[in-house]
Amino acid sequence: LRRCLISTDMHHIEESFQEIKRAIQAKDTFPNVTILSTLETLQIIKPLDVCCVTKNLLAFYVDRVFKDHQEPNPKILRKISSIANSFLYMQKTLRQCQEQRQCHCRQEATNATRVIHDNYDQLEVHAAAIKSLGELDVFLAWINKNHEVMFSA
């Protein structure tokens, strides 16, 4: 785990998300359905799988959620773009880690992310994107809990 650090400013991402959270969640047309929120799977991820699950969830947001989401409000769009950009850099940092064979993907890790993709696929694409954005705090909290995130001075 120590060799798989994410060098980015989590505080900045969380701040950006808090500014748009209410507006995003207000657009959620399926409040009783969840994509990440009830995932006990995320809570029982072993330290060995943290890097892989993080990598897969970053890919989920970068390659699916941020591509599927259509945001008409320029102010909110700027914030989402900023979060997406930070995720992209985190993804590249973890890819570097994976290149050095420090990011193993075991079956448990693959299963955990498959559940998220399955949940996403059960909703219409724009509704799924909105819901996943609204649940970003779940992912951010999980990263904070499971990673030694480096806050540079």
């Epitope: 980015t8 997406a84 850099y89």
Partner: antibody, heavy 122, light 107 residues
């Protein structure tokens, strides 16, 4: 309008250090990653690394690891690139460049400084 | 490090010509790729990002295509201001690397 203004040309002796500055204006400095790219005379472009002005986090190309230090001063919206133990083959134009922020996310250097020529000669 | 091989290294063309420059990566880089134009004594200019997205303000005669290992920059109708050196960049893996450049000259 967005501008990246770099410090002036430098002449250094081998073994010395150089610190190039890049002053940003016309946008929120902490909202965009900044990269450093160099170009030796008559040669191609070479990526050196990036700094996240918001956190100060960095990532350097392996080639420059241990010799390069990228820092920033958010109070004056300025990024710095210091290269130590200079050699003659470090003679190049050094550019700072801002990364785009788009959706879906992607990398692209949309604004560049004018370049700083660093000459290393005994 | 991932190597990018541009071809040709130089070409001569006339105004109005259709010009194609290719860049081959030494391994799969998905679409983490861009094209830049540089004129003598000037900083590079972003043309294409994410392999095929046209940067704002860049004329539509420029287009990018490809993914994986093979990428192409096409100028549909070469204009006098397009004579320059073109570089590709991969940002899939650190260290990010540029191609060696393709110089487009007037025939």
């Amino acid at each position: 309008q967005v501008q990246l203004v770099q410090s002036g040309a430098e002449v250094k002796k081998p073994g010395a250090s150089v610190k190039v500055s890049c002053k940003a204006s016309g946008y929120t400095f902490t909202g965009y990653y900044l990269h450093w790219v160099r170009q030796a005379p008559g040669q191609g472009l070479e990526w050196m690394g990036w700094i996240n002005p918001n956190s100060g986090g960095t990532n350097y190309a392996q080639k420059f690891q241990g010799r390069v230090t990228m820092t920033r001063d958010t109070s004056i919206s300025t990024a710095y690139m210091e290269l130590s133990r200079l050699r003659s083959d470090d003679t190049a134009v050094y550019y700072c460049a801002r990364d785009i922020v788009v959706l879906p996310p992607a990398i692209g250097f949309d604004y560049w400084g004018q370049g700083t020529l660093v000459t290393v000669s005994s | 490090a991932i190597q990018l091989t541009q071809s040709p290294s130089s070409l001569s063309a006339s105004v109005g010509d259709r010009v194609t420059i290719t860049c081959r990566a030494s391994q799969d880089i998905r679409s983490d790729f861009g094209w830049y134009q540089q004129k003598p004594g000037k900083a590079p200019k972003l043309l294409i990002y994410a392999a095929s997205s046209l940067q704002s303000g860049v004329p539509s005669r420029f287009s990018g295509s490809g993914s994986g290992t093979d990428f192409t920059l096409t100028i549909s109708s070469l204009q006098p201001e397009d004579f320059a050196t073109y570089y590709c960049l991969q940002d899939y893996n650190y260290p990010w690397t540029f191609g060696q450049g393709t110089k487009v000259e007037i025939k």
